[in-house]
């Protein structure tokens, strides 16, 4: 059976949100009225892994891109990337590790937890216009929190 | 230090099944991030990746063996294992286990090889 | 799958030569590339890993480099004991793809 996907955008916890930095970085900042248009639309697929109620293993591609959130070592740091697929091949049901991410809803708050890397999450930086990056530490000065906005095929 | 030694291999009839061991030691097959797994070599021939297993338990397998191959572990004992079922000749093969650590991979340590032999 | 292909598969050369092995891909596996050598009844040994890092206690002679779907290993000057089969390996995707190897023997 192919893999289950649905587009969707997010938003950290500050309503930053995510727009494409360069071919390979994600940044958050505040978006309003027609800039809106500019945030990235995530192919989010529900691929295999060690599933709970609270707890949802996903793939995150971009909308209509060959490119997918992917957690590596870079010089000995779990580091978050957009890396390039064969769209032939992609999304499949059978990740590689690097793509997956637990999605975990809290108090209707998401967060995106690298299966390769526990207790690393996606996170934003207070900061406005910053890299989207792999975080060690939750409940800091780093955001780890989204909501996730459905869009229509 | 780490360790790898397989066992389990000999010889076998096609058609039958054998249980391979690899015994870790040096390091622990439940640490985050580790992965283990099994690589074979036909004789005279190169090398091919079978199956692999990560620390959560998340198993993968080369798509020409899976429904005859199944691997596991016993995390008290420090052990890896792979179960070969319905052995064909073309099975015939020296089996090495191999310690990696995260996505992609490459293969650090090396276990000496244990000798499947499929023939009647 | 992707396949891994390795050129030549057979080389001949001396000690002191510089010696080249390609392993080409049959699609950009960007730069998740694995070297390893491997001596007859012996297990092999990981040489290079992201196609350019030399692992720990490999002697420096040993260089890896290439991105997306071609790659080399170069061997700057040829020791007695390089004499051996080298394989590439494929981490981008499952399943995970070693080439078919190359041999290097004493002219």
């Known amino acids: 059976a192919p893999v289950r996907s649905l587009n969707c955008t997010l938003r950290d916890s500050q309503q930053k949100s995510l727009v494409m930095s360069g071919p390979y970085e994600l940044k958050a900042l505040h978006l309003q009225g027609q800039d809106m248009e500019q945030q990235v639309v995530f192919s989010m697929s529900f691929v295999q892994g060690e599933e709970s109620n609270d707890k949802i293993p996903v793939a995150l591609g971009l909308k209509e891109k060959n490119l997918y959130l992917s957690c590596v070592l870079k010089d000995d740091k779990p580091t978050l990337q957009l890396e390039s697929v064969d769209p032939k091949n992609y999304p499949k049901k059978k990740m590689e590790k690097r793509f997956v991410f637990n999605k975990i809803e809290i108090n209707n708050k998401l967060e995106f937890e690298s299966a390769q890397f526990p207790n690393w999450y996606i996170s934003t930086s207070q900061a406005e216009n910053m890299p989207v990056f792999l975080g060690g530490t939750k409940g800091g000065q780093d955001i780890t929190d989204f909501t996730m906005q459905f869009v229509s095929s | 230090e780490v360790q790898l030694v397989e066992s389990g291999g000999g010889l076998v009839q096609p058609g039958g099944s054998l249980r391979l061991s690899c015994a870790a030691s040096?390091?622990?097959?439940?640490?985050?991030?580790?992965?283990v797994g099994w690589v074979r070599q036909a004789p005279g021939k190169g090398l091919e990746w079978v199956s692999h297993i990560w620390w959560d338990g998340d198993e993968s397998y080369n798509p020409s063996l899976k429904s005859r191959f199944t691997i596991s572990r016993d995390n008290s004992k420090n052990t890896l294992y792979l179960q070969m079922n319905s052995l064909r000749a073309e099975d015939t093969a020296v089996y090495y286990c191999a310690k990696n650590r995260y996505d992609p991979p490459w293969f650090v340590d090396w276990g000496q090889g244990t000798l499947v032999t499929v023939s009647s | 799958e992707i396949v891994m292909t390795q050129s030549p598969s057979t080389l001949s050369a001396s000690v002191g030569d510089r010696v080249i092995i390609t392993c080409r891909a049959s699609q950009d596996i960007s730069n998740y590339l694995s070297w390893y050598q491997q001596k007859p009844g012996k297990a092999p040994k990981l040489l290079i890993y992201?196609?350019?890092k030399l692992h720990s206690g490999v002697p420096s002679r040993f260089s890896g480099s290439g991105s997306g779907a071609e790659f080399t290993l170069t061997i700057s000057s040829l020791q007695p004991d390089d004499f051996a089969t080298y394989y590439c390996?494929?981490?981008?995707?499952?399943?995970?793809?070693f080439g078919q190897g190359t041999k290097l023997t004493v002219k």
């Open positions: 040096g390091f622990s097959l439940s640490t985050s991030g580790m992965g």
């Open positions: 390996l494929q981490g981008k995707m499952l399943p995970w793809t």
């Open positions: 992201y196609t350019s």
